[in-house]
């Protein structure tokens, strides 16, 4: 059974983990990013199910995918400083998130979809899992 | 245990900038997120945005952005916060609270903005 | 931006009295609100976290309910100590936000 802290800890990783990806989501969505049009023309997958941590192998996956839009869409006014430092980041906390002991195939969905799509997608993943830590 | 505290109250002219200091104690600064909110005289609690000790990263509300700048020096667990082009609006207590749910807070800077 | 409505914006109670204060987010937030107390020319307190979860050392009068948009707090018997300004605050969605606060004073 997981103890208080270690359910700290997960709600604390859980946490950075929702503000890095709204981080990304709001400089994406921000109005004055003029590459938006050509990023959601980049597909992502997404989970089949995603209901436990453990799903965060399918985010994982995701990463460099992701790492390489948000490089390609870096202009004067849509600037996330440090774009590999922040995917860096994400991938230790997801690492930790899912644990290592069982490694699991990630099932996807037949309909991939766009960064927008992708990004609300996991924020909405952590709110959820989040909400029913105690 | 943990605390968080800031620096004192400072007076500013229009224009100028302001930088405010937040020093962490009783936990590992690295580890938790520094949020930092204000709250004009009377009005209610504004949330200006976050950054991540550890790597630095930092997230500015919209309202700020090109304003402010939020940066931390790890080797004396402190976060700073600076806010430059100042206005009369901003006179208001600077606060950083720490993470997501703010569970401590610093006991506020009083930032008067006057000509 | 998720708006939070709190309400009442004040409210006069007598000691012993049952305190609720309520707080509507503008779109679902899950159970990811929590609230706070300041005391005037203090920082504010954390009470409640995750919407009915009561922070470490905070007494147990205090209490938090609800998810999705509709969220309850109650003082369940007024204390003299328990003045001061009440705020909850939605931690799903960036930015931040607060509900505009609740004035609570002793009749």
């Known amino acids: 059974a997981p103890t208080s802290s270690s359910t700290k800890k997960t709600q604390l990783q859980l946490e950075h983990l929702l503000l890095d990806l709204q981080m990304i989501l709001n400089g994406i969505n921000n109005y004055k990013n003029p590459k938006l049009t050509r990023m959601l023309t980049f597909k992502f997958y997404m989970p089949k199910k995603a209901t436990e941590l453990r799903h965060l192998q399918c985010l994982e996956e995701e990463l460099k995918p992701l790492e390489e839009v948000l490089n390609l869409a870096q202009s004067k006014s849509f600037h996330l400083r440090d774009t590999k430092d922040l995917i860096s980041n994400i991938n230790v906390i997801v690492l930790e998130l899912k644990g290592s002991e069982t490694t699991l195939m990630c099932e996807y969905a037949d309909e991939t979809a766009t960064i927008v799509e992708f990004l609300n997608r996991w924020i909405t993943f952590c709110q959820s899992i989040i909400s029913t830590l105690t | 245990q943990v605390q968080l505290v800031q620096s004192g109250a400072e007076v500013k002219k229009p224009g100028a900038s302001v930088k405010v200091s937040c020093k962490a104690s009783?936990?590992?600064?690295?580890?938790?997120?520094m949020h930092w909110v204000r709250q004009a005289p009377g009005q209610g609690l504004e949330w200006m945005g976050w950054?991540?000790?550890?790597?630095?990263?930092?997230n500015y509300a919209q309202k700020f952005q090109g304003r402010v700048t939020m940066t931390r020096d790890t080797s004396i667990s402190t976060a700073y916060m600076e806010l430059s082009r100042l206005r009369s609006d901003d006179t208001a207590v600077y606060y950083c609270?720490?993470?997501?749910?703010?569970?401590?807070w610093g006991q506020g800077t009083l930032v008067t903005v006057s000509s | 931006a998720i708006q939070l409505t709190q309400s009442p914006s004040s409210l006069s109670a007598s000691v012993g009295d049952r305190v609720t204060i309520t707080c509507q987010a503008s779109?679902?937030?899950?159970?990811?609100l929590n609230w706070y107390r300041q005391k005037p020319g203090k920082a504010p307190d954390l009470l409640v976290y995750?919407?009915?979860n009561l922070e470490t050392g905070v007494p147990s009068r205090f209490s938090g309910s609800g998810s999705g948009t509709d969220f309850t707090f109650t003082i369940s018997s007024l204390q003299p100590e328990d003045v001061g300004t009440y705020y909850c605050?939605?931690?799903?969605?960036?930015?931040?936000?607060f509900g505009g606060g609740t004035k609570v004073e002793i009749k």
């Open positions: 779109q679902d937030i899950f159970n990811l």
């Open positions: 605050q939605q931690s799903a969605n960036l930015p931040l936000t």
């Open positions: 995750r919407a009915s």
């Open positions: 609270a720490r993470d997501l749910t703010f569970d401590y």
């Open positions: 950054i991540n000790p550890n790597s630095g990263g930092t």
């Open positions: 009783g936990y590992t600064f690295t580890g938790y997120y």
